[in-house]
């Protein structure tokens, strides 16, 4: 029961992260004017991954596309391309672990199969929450590093009688959703990995066969293959000698832990 | 197309409160846009007081944000200005304007002359 | 508070010929993230209240003849009337919609020589 409740809640947890990786991408506010000094403006400039708008205090709004590729800054490219990826990995993370689902049956599928998918879709959502946590850690030192520097620029070169305001930016909220989306993904991802280690079945409950070989018999036992997970050992793949050949019967069956779910 | 129509008494006296209201035709003050008052004094150039934006938050001129109030009353799609402690430097012409793209007034109210006078 | 300083106070110019009206603020009303000119040109007649003209400090307003245009950017900006009608006869006024309070210049009177 612990082990569909871990799979349910990282699926519902990664799930929750994922559209707040979509909704932070898409977001305009990832770099907002920065209102310390003037805390009532008459236009305010914030900016997105995609976009840049101006909000009028009289209730104007315009938004502009970045509609060049090349003259756009090289980090902000690879802050795209980091929430992209992010979301590709979480989307295929949120389809491969629709199928791993525990309380979901499609046809005949074992549980070392679902085990094998839920660890998948487990690193895809790590991958996917770190891709986040790195894209939104980019934007920010670059718009630290750009803040200090306007600050800088703006107590030189007043000598002349006219002043220039210049615009400094700073953190928007799309910032604070993709960490905490990252945060959630990054954590519903190692939810779906612990489950997996339940799920992989430690002995499975089939019927050993007996080959009956001249000499001696020997009972082939199959073991539960942890389904590749590197969690455990594999030593459960034992060949069962004793004196003389068993019926089906006699040998002992151990029964999943699975099965009382 | 948004019209608006200034409305209120002429003639203040010193130290009283001047209250004005401006009745809007044909859009709704919640719907968007700012709605200001300026103020022209007779043969002077103009001055704007102040504005109550379509979700209600209002900004003022520093010079007479102690003496003014600028509310609103949805209700019958009006705003009001409010100048306490008035004197005679505050005769003036009192327009009413939207503001909108460029922060620019496009539409004004035809005005209306306050003298204060005892 | 930005200062928006108008020149001339007045001009005279014939029917027909062009008239340039200059402004100038104590601040660059130029916004970095759109940049735009927030500067507005308007009109007024006596006894009426002002009209827009100009936005953004080149955008004319629908319906404002052409022969109307803004230039300038930063702190330095001009409004011309190419050929001056007996109808433009009026007073300009410069205003600030960069920076709170919105300020306007003292006006420019525009008549005919």
């Known amino acids: 029961m612990a082990v569909t409740a871990c799979q349910g809640l990282g699926f519902v947890v990664s799930l929750i992260g994922i559209a707040g990786i979509i909704a932070a991408t898409c977001m305009d506010q990832w770099s907002t004017q920065d209102l310390y000094n003037n805390p009532v403006t008459a236009v305010f400039n914030y900016q997105g991954l995609w976009r840049s708008c101006v909000r009028e205090s009289s209730g104007f709004t315009e938004c502009r596309g970045y509609f060049t590729l090349l003259g756009l800054p090289a980090m902000l490219q690879a802050v795209r391309a980091l929430m992209i990826v992010g979301i590709v990995l979480g989307a295929i993370g949120l389809l491969v672990s629709i199928f791993a689902l525990k309380c979901i049956r499609i046809g005949s599928m074992e549980d070392s199969a679902k085990a094998n998918m839920t660890l998948t879709s487990g690193i895809m959502f790590i991958v996917s929450g770190l891709c986040a946590i790195a894209g939104v850690s980019v934007f920010a030192n670059m718009l630290v590093t750009n803040f200090w520097m306007s600050t800088a620029n703006m107590y030189t070169g007043m000598g002349g009688m006219v002043q220039t305001v210049q615009t400094r930016y700073t953190f928007g909220a799309a910032l604070f959703v993709g960490w905490v989306a990252g945060g959630l993904t990054l954590i519903g991802g190692v939810m779906m990995c612990i489950a997996c280690r339940g799920l992989a079945p430690e002995e499975t409950n089939y019927k050993a066969v007996s080959y009956h070989a001249s000499g001696h018999s020997v009972a082939y036992k199959p073991g539960g293959f942890k389904a590749s997970t590197g969690f455990g050992s594999n030593t459960k793949n034992k060949k069962i000698y004793d004196g003389g050949a068993r019926t089906e019967d006699e040998v002992q069956s151990y029964p999943s832990k699975h099965d009382y779910v | 197309q948004v019209q608006l129509q200034e409305s209120g008494p002429g003639l203040v006296k010193p130290s009283e409160t001047l209250s004005l209201t401006c009745t809007v035709s044909?859009?709704?003050?919640?719907?968007?846009?700012?709605w200001n008052w300026i103020r022209q004094p007779p043969g002077k150039g103009l001055e704007w007081i102040g504005y109550?934006?379509?979700?209600?938050?209002?900004n003022y001129n520093p010079s007479l944000k102690s003496r003014v109030t600028i509310s609103r009353d949805t209700s019958k799609n009006q705003f009001s200005l409010k100048l306490s402690s008035v004197t005679a430097a505050d005769t003036a012409v009192y327009y009413c304007?939207?503001?909108?793209?460029?922060?620019?007034?496009?539409?004004w109210g035809q005005g209306t002359l306050v003298t204060v006078s005892s | 508070d930005i200062v928006m300083t108008q020149s001339p106070d007045s001009l005279a110019v014939s029917l027909g010929e062009r008239a340039t009206i200059n402004c100038k603020s104590s601040?660059?009303?130029?916004?970095?993230?759109?940049?735009?000119?927030?500067l507005t040109w308007y009109q007024q007649k006596p006894g009426q209240p002002p009209k827009l003209l100009i936005y953004?400090?080149?955008t004319r307003e629908s319906g404002v003849p052409d022969r109307f245009s803004g230039s300038g950017s930063g702190t330095d900006f001009t409004l011309t009337i190419s050929s001056l009608q007996a109808e433009d006869v009026a007073v300009y006024y410069c205003?600030?919609?960069?920076?709170?309070?919105?300020?306007f210049g003292q006006g420019t009177k525009v008549e005919i020589k």
């Open positions: 304007a939207t503001s909108y793209y460029g922060n620019s007034f496009i539409y």
């Open positions: 601040q660059s009303l130029l916004n970095s993230g759109n940049q735009k000119n927030y």
């Open positions: 205003q600030n919609a960069y920076s709170f309070p919105w300020t």
């Open positions: 044909g859009y709704s003050i919640t719907s968007n846009y700012a």
């Open positions: 953004w400090a080149s």
């Open positions: 109550i934006n379509y979700s209600g938050n209002t």
